[in-house]
């Protein structure tokens, strides 16, 4: 039912995050007269769209409209009718669609076209659907968390208590893990960013920021698992893959055609003497970790230092917010506490992975088996990526903060995206020209 009370002097915005594994709709709200203040925008709703990511609709584009209906209807309920026409709607697609575009630009365009037509049917101010770059995804995630932590302004924030010791203006780095890609973004300490592709310069609220960012396509948790399976099946002696990243007693049949469907496994593709193989879990953290490390090429680095695969990475600096799947996985494993050391996380993972599958299913009866079965891999992957990939150490681990929400708003790229596209991040303090969209492209 519509709210008939006097309209508040507020504005709304909607962003759809079309990720590789699912789509989420976020509704943001802010006081109309304080558009250019930092910290005034906050999330009022999240609606998770039922079903997979939009890239999976490539053979059934006619179903996209129905797929988006529930969450768009929810937005209609939450936002007062009087505000509908002036509420902007943006859809940003991330690495799942980047991968589809690599396979076929035509197919990716077809999906986006149907998405746009579906979203145009609603009474909101639809501003378009596009595939955002990995650089944008990293940058907007960094903007989101620092905006919510009040890092861009000395002024009083709209919320009273800011978490994570944010009494200084030193920005947080952003660590984002999705299903198909992962992003690392931070301000390095007095360090030249040796690779221009990884450098962003922008001016926010009167201050200049030189930001490092990189998005590793195919290194999101789901695509990393496909990569690992494709790598390991190469050396399997038959159609049984004894996999240390799954619990002892776990079994699952995988179609080779599914394995090689993604561009992420192309480098491991070979003609196998079988169409299917069976994963048999053996639950060994150490072996799982070793297998994952083989996905990171650390032997080649054309810069002073690299993350992996020859990608420049400056020395880590300051505190980091780790969100999206970094948070969801660690939260499930009960490892998000600031007090849990890296050594303790490793010990817990060893124990968790070694637990028999039947025991795990009983302990977590309410969790879907598909997700439940992959937490051992995902937790081990997170450790491998952070320690070996990004060079966090036992020391710097304590400066990683696993963040789900900050003052009620989800950590992720969507808020930063909307702030930028609605010109709500002024370059100057208090008000001047907004950060141009082209800054990121």
């Amino acid at each position: 039912t519509q709210n008939k009370a006097l309209p508040e002097n507020v504005k709304y915005g909607i962003v759809l995050d079309a990720g590789s594994s699912h789509t989420s709709l976020y509704i943001y709200k802010w006081p109309a007269e304080k558009e250019n203040d930092t910290g005034v925008v906050h999330q009022v709703e999240e609606c998770r769209v039922k079903g997979p990511g939009i890239s999976k609709f490539v053979q059934k584009v006619n179903e996209i409209g129905i797929y988006l209906t529930d969450c768009m209807e929810r937005a209609r309920e939450v936002i007062p009718r009087s505000q509908h026409q002036e509420t902007p709607v943006y859809l940003g697609a991330t690495a799942g669609m980047r991968l589809l575009r690599m396979e076929s630009e035509e197919l990716a365009d077809r999906v986006l076209d149907v998405v746009e037509r579906s979203l145009s049917n609603y009474p909101f101010d639809f501003q378009g659907a596009r595939i955002i770059t990995g650089q944008e995804e990293g940058a907007y995630g960094w903007i989101t968390i620092n905006y919510l932590l009040g890092k861009f302004s000395q002024k009083t924030r709209w919320f009273s208590i800011v978490p994570y010791e944010t009494n200084n203006q030193e920005t947080f780095g952003a660590l984002d893990l999705g299903g198909a890609s992962t992003q690392v973004t931070f301000v390095p300490q007095n360090q030249t960013i040796e690779s221009p592709d990884n450098a962003l310069q922008f001016r926010l609220y009167g201050k200049d920021y030189n930001v490092y960012t990189h998005s590793f396509l195919c290194y999101g948790k789901d695509q990393a698992l496909w990569q690992k399976l494709a790598k390991d099946i190469q050396v399997a002696s038959n159609e049984i893959l004894r996999d240390p990243c799954f619990h002892p007693g776990y079994k699952k049949v995988v179609n080779v055609s599914d394995l090689y469907k993604t561009p992420c496994t192309k480098r491991f593709e070979m003609t196998l003497p079988f169409q299917q193989f069976e994963i048999q879990g053996i639950g060994n953290y150490q072996q799982c970790h070793q297998s994952i490390l083989e996905l990171f090429n650390t032997s080649y680095c054309p810069y002073s230092q690299c993350a992996f695969n020859g990608i420049f990475l400056p020395p880590l600096q300051g505190d980091f917010g780790a969100f999206s799947a970094f948070y969801f996985v660690m939260k499930f494993l009960n490892l998000t506490s600031e007090k849990v050391s890296q050594e303790k996380v490793t010990e817990m993972m060893k124990k968790f992975c070694a637990q028999p599958w039947e025991e795990i299913k009983t302990s977590y009866a309410g969790v879907k088996e598909k997700y439940l079965s992959e937490y051992c891999f995902s937790g081990t992957y997170i450790l491998s990526l952070l320690l070996q990939g990004y060079h966090f150490t036992a020391d710097s681990w304590e400066h990683i903060h696993f963040i789900g929400k900050i003052q009620g708003s989800d950590a992720g790229w969507t808020l930063g995206y909307m702030l930028n596209l609605t010109n709500m991040i002024p370059a100057e303090q208090p008000l001047s020209t907004p950060l141009s969209h082209s800054t990121y492209v």
């Epitope: 650390t298 020395p315 036992a394």
Partner: antibody
Framework: SVEESGGRLVTPGTPLTLTCTVS????????ISWVRQAPGKGLEYIAI?????TTYYASWAKGRVTISKTSSTVDLKISSPTTEDTATYFC??????????????WGPGTLVTVSS | AYDMTQTPASVEVAVGGTVTIKCQAS??????LAWYQQKPGQRPKLLIY???SLASGVPSRFSGSGSGTEFTLTISGVQCDDAATYYC????????????FGGGTEVVVK
């Protein structure tokens, strides 16, 4: 650069403070470690204070030494030196958290002799 | 603790020869290992960081390899100036620094 000072001849039990003075970089961005070397022996790690002011000690040093910092100096206080503490004491700069990328900048060292 | 065991304690090598020094960590330290050179009466000098990255100004005849628990420093085409003691050091955890340096390897150049 980093430079140690305060090394001298002391009698056992006489408290001693060594100072590491830094220039050209900020202690809010880097960690400082203290390392010592007894005559003719190898390097021995003593303690570290990271950019956040968090301190860590080798287990043998806990209770015997204290590391602290100001804006441009890092002190190592040896509360009750024994003859075993005779060594050259070095301070060295690591990365912001510790020595994850090695100790790239070392002072020349300061000699402490403990003798009765 | 992350105990570091360095071998050999001493090695003799002819000018132009190759010397290999090994360092073993008691636990996985990933790539967080540094190598230092120290000459008598001098301060240590960083040669290699993160197991295989050459520090600024270090000649390319020095190279590092390994990850996890096994690491190697190799000096190819040894020169007289390379006579020194070499130390490895784990840079993974400050919380466990009881034996963060290896015992050292003395390289004698003939």
């Amino acid at each position: 650069s980093v430079e140690e000072s305060g090394g001298r001849l002391v009698t056992p039990g006489t408290p001693l403070t060594l100072t590491c003075t830094v220039s050209g970089f900020s202690l809010s961005s880097y960690a400082i470690s203290w390392v010592r070397q007894a005559p003719g022996k190898g390097l021995e790690y003593i303690a570290i204070i990271n950019s956040y002011g968090t301190t860590y000690y080798a287990s043998w040093a806990k209770g015997r030494v204290t590391i602290s910092k100001t804006s441009s100096t890092v002190d190592l206080k040896i509360s009750s030196p024994t003859t075993e503490d005779t060594a050259t004491y070095f301070c060295a700069r690591g990365d912001s958290y510790g020595s994850g990328v090695g100790l790239g900048l070392w002072g020349p060292g300061t000699l402490v002799t403990v003798s009765s | 603790a992350y105990d570091m065991t360095q071998t050999p304690a001493s090695v003799e090598v002819a000018v132009g020869g190759t010397v290999t020094i090994k360092c073993q960590a008691s636990q996985n330290i990933y790539s967080n290992l540094a190598w230092y050179q120290q000459k008598p009466g001098q301060r240590p000098k960083l040669l290699i960081y993160r197991a295989s990255s050459l520090a600024s100004g270090v000649p390319s005849r020095f190279s590092g390899s390994g990850s996890g628990t096994e690491f190697t420093l190799t000096i190819s085409g040894v020169q007289c100036d390379d006579a020194a003691t070499y130390y490895c050091q784990q840079g993974f955890s400050s919380n466990n620094v009881d034996n963060t340096f290896g015992g050292g390897t003395e390289v004698v150049v003939k």
